[in-house]
């Protein structure tokens, strides 16, 4: 696969993943009422990171935001933080990767700069994806713990209801946002890895160039071994260029080869 394709695909996959992370963060259905014992319910509860909602069978839905910071569980705060960090890193990653794309010309930016930016954006996407996956997983773990705790106390005589009165506790299970978050985090991670792979194809590597032979006299001849393009136009062959006509020349100078930037 060509570097451009790998980089482009990595960018697109990361972009889709990033959009998914934002969607998951904003979704209200991080946890939904468990309907295993009662599949037909008159009141359906579901909760997100920012608000909890109730949907009645009448169709009326009411959502209430969590208007407190101090009163919220530390785990929920941690999940919020992880998702926001993931989004922030994703935004930075997207901005950096746009400038790093090989198919976009920006002034006289050379390939080594683009390689560094591609690597940077790749790492940002990887961290962003990991943040999302960890955030969602922490929330899922919290749900599982609470689920089994509420199962153990399913019919309790507490909460001001004395005697034999049953108080059925609402149990919550995985909501759609968790699955969106896991998939989105995974995509962002994969996209980031692809960007990092593409970076390897853009990185100037001296070992890939042939040895330099000197034809000249004893004078000091300046030469540069790397011959990197100043522009980022497609299809131009990058060959090592002589600085002086009579100066250092490489053994490849006489031939035109596909460059290392065109194929991986």
């Amino acid at each position: 696969m060509s570097v451009t394709a790998c980089q482009g695909l990595g960018f697109v996959v990361s972009l889709i993943g990033f959009a998914g992370i934002i969607a998951a963060t904003c979704m209200d259905q991080w946890s939904t009422q468990d309907l295993y014992n009662n599949p037909v319910t008159a009141v359906f509860n579901y909760q997100g990171l920012w608000r909890s909602c109730v949907r009645e069978s009448s169709g009326f839905t009411e959502c209430r935001g969590y208007f407190t910071l101090l009163g919220l569980p530390a785990m929920l705060q941690a999940v919020r933080a992880l998702m926001i960090v993931g989004i922030v890193l994703g935004v930075i990653g997207i901005l950096v990767s746009i400038f790093a794309l090989k198919c976009i010309r920006i002034g006289s930016m050379d390939d080594s700069a683009k390689a560094k930016m591609t690597l940077t954006s790749g790492i940002l996407f990887i961290i962003s994806g990991i943040c999302a996956i960890i955030g969602v997983s922490v929330f899922a773990n919290m749900l599982v713990t609470n689920f089994w705790m509420s199962t153990a106390n399913m019919y309790s005589g507490m909460g001001g209801m004395g005697g034999m009165v049953q108080t059925v506790q609402t149990r919550y299970t995985f909501g759609a946002a968790l699955f969106v978050g896991w998939v989105a985090g995974g995509l962002t991670l994969i996209g980031g890895v692809m960007m990092c792979i593409a970076c390897r194809g853009l990185t100037p590597d001296d070992s890939n160039f042939k040895a330099v032979s000197y034809h000249a006299s004893g004078q000091n001849v300046a030469y540069r071994p790397g011959g990197f393009k100043a522009s980022t136009g497609f299809g131009s062959n990058t060959r090592n260029k002589k600085i002086y006509d009579g100066g250092a020349r490489t053994e490849d100078d006489e031939q035109s080869h596909p460059t290392k930037y065109d194929y991986v």
Partner: antibody
Framework: QVQLQQPGPELVMPGASVKLSCKAS????????MHWVKQRPGQGLEWIGE????????NYNQNFRGRSTLTVDKSSSTAYMQLSSLTSGDSAVYYC???????????WGQGTSVTVSS | DIVMTQSPSSLTVTAGEKVTVGCKSS????????????LTWYQQKPGQPPKLLIY???TRESGVPDRFTGSGSGTDFTLTIRSVQAEDLAVYYC?????????FGSGTKLEIK
Amino acid sequence: QVQLQQPGPELVMPGASVKLSCKASGYTFTSYRMHWVKQRPGQGLEWIGEIDPSNSYTNYNQNFRGRSTLTVDKSSSTAYMQLSSLTSGDSAVYYCARLGRGNTLGYWGQGTSVTVSS
Amino acid sequence: DIVMTQSPSSLTVTAGEKVTVGCKSSQSLLNSGNQKNYLTWYQQKPGQPPKLLIYWASTRESGVPDRFTGSGSGTDFTLTIRSVQAEDLAVYYCQNGYSYPFTFGSGTKLEIK
């Protein structure tokens, strides 16, 4: 304004079946579930079941499942309840009612009196 | 199924008196998601269909006189008529709107002396 129109009394033979209608007007018929409630003479209210006119989803009280069938005709904004294998215990007033906010039955029809007698 | 128990089954009062009707459910009707009690009160006058009075245990339906108030939470609920009028002669029902099947109390018949 919201109106639920139910026809007059029905006299049916034991073992027969009857189909009661409830014509809705004054609101978007498919936006609200329709409920049916039974009231025997001098007795309390008993919930029969509900139907969602938008997708014909039904939910029945276990006591009425099998003997009652709820349907809708969206084109005429009418809900129907068919009661089969009628017995004297089915003699009652049957109300249709529209479900509203708070899972309340906010609007009721006038009720159809069904008398099962030979 | 949630069983709704109303008390008393009937009561006779004089106009202007304060009346309280009780309703007890076999399970809590308090929904943790919105902290609302799914308990509804209806008034049924002779020869008429029931009329919605109060929902969410304490929210008065529009058009209902403010002498009618609902209170309670969890499993114990009360309908209070602050100053009974002659037109309040009716049967009052409580209803569970929290879980299927919807269930009604047996009713409280209010008679005016």
